[in-house]
Amino acid sequence: APVRSLNCTLRDSQQKSLVMSGPYELKALHLQGQDMEQQVVFSMSFVQGEESNDKIPVALGLKEKNLYLSCVLKDDKPTLQLESVDPKNYPKKKMEKRFVFNKIEINNKLEFESAQFPNWYISTSQAENMPVFLGGTKGGQDITDFTMQFVSS
């Protein structure tokens, strides 16, 4: 069975959009009107992994770019990065664990938990124009809830 993917954009629960900030970083900020075209379109691939209740394992690539969000240790801290891959080999059903996120979808709100680092989530800051990062707390100051907007292929 080939990998199933969908194209989407993500906004945090404060309606901040995600845009590229340099070649290997995403940031979150409020966009309006034509500026909305700056937001990153993800190719969300449904990959094999541990399933439980509303957890679905996914990989988050940047559409038509050979970049995937991945989770690695940097200075002993789980860190979110954009990693370059060989486009001939990705996406694939059996993604390396650093690329896998458990998508938790409840009442149209999404969280993305790192499969590599349980209880660490894709997060944004309350402040504008700050990097998207991997956060180890839920329900605190940082934002871990997102909404997804489908984009036609």
Epitope: A1, L6, Q48, E51, K94, K103
Partner: antibody, heavy 118, light 106 residues
Framework: QVTLKESGPALLKPTQTLTLTCTFS??????????VSWIRQPSGKALEWLAH???????RYNPSLKSRLTISKDTSSNQVFLKITNVDTVDTATYYC??????????WGQGTLVSVSA | DIQMTQSHSSMSTSVGDRVRITCRAS??????VAWFQQKPGQAPKLLIY???TRHSGVPSRFSGSGSGTDFTLTISNVQPEDFADYYC????????FGAGTKLELK
């Protein structure tokens, strides 16, 4: 937690149409990536995958049975249905529904036994 | 379609033994293989996916190996509750199952 339960007629006659219902809880078929399959098992025999439906209403069928199968869903009622037309005695089996985002079926219903007899 | 062949329809073993249940795919399925345990009157239970990844809650005595066409489910230190039917399944193309191997008490 995730639960699935199959229901349908216990007994049918050959040539009739079998309609099965899978009622589930603990997850939603509106969740992107989610899917439910139907699988059957004649008594004492192997498992046979029949059909799968995804959250986006994409459907997959076992090629050898495709002409007789229709899978559908009612997302708001948390139900998946399977219709098998023109049943015969070889369709006598326990029918299971199983949840899978992929095809390694992590959650199964208890099964419902369907007998086809003249 | 891809056939999954379990060469032994039944195998006999004793409590505490190690047993290997094998399965062969009719064509290369990479590691797209799952193993299930089924007890009489019950639904199958997922043990292994990706050929070698244990499903959550599955005891560590169950392990899977293989890739391509040849796959093995190993139960080390067989326990009384392990006597059951075991099925392999591929999901490289539309899912197909092996005919099953009944693990019996010697």
């Amino acid at each position: 937690q995730v639960t699935l339960k199959e229901s349908g007629p216990a007994l049918l006659k050959p040539t009739q149409t079998l309609t099965l219902t899978c009622t589930f809880s603990g997850f939603s078929l509106s969740t992107s990536g989610m899917g439910v399959s139907w699988i059957r098992q004649p008594s004492g025999k192997a498992l046979e995958w029949l059909a799968h439906i995804y959250w986006d209403d994409d459907k997959r069928y076992n090629p050898s049975l495709k002409s007789r199968l229709t899978i559908s869903k009612d997302t708001s009622s948390n139900q998946v249905f399977l219709k098998i037309t023109n049943v015969d005695t070889v369709d006598t089996a326990t029918y299971y529904c199983a949840r899978s985002a992929y095809y390694s079926f992590a959650y199964w219903g208890q099964g419902t036994l369907v007998s086809v007899s003249a | 379609d891809i056939q999954m062949t379990q060469s032994h329809s039944s195998m006999s073993t004793s409590v505490g033994d190690r047993v290997r249940i094998t399965c062969r795919a009719s064509q290369d399925v990479d590691t797209d293989v799952a193993w299930f345990q089924q007890k009489p009157g019950q639904a199958p239970k997922l043990l292994i996916y990706w050929a070698s990844t244990r499903h959550s809650g599955v005891p560590s005595r169950f392990s899977g190996s293989g890739s391509g066409t040849d796959f093995t489910l190993t139960i080390s230190n067989v326990q009384p509750e392990d006597f059951a039917d075991y099925y392999c399944q591929q999901y490289s193309s539309y899912p197909t199952f092996g005919a099953g191997t009944k693990l019996e008490l010697k």
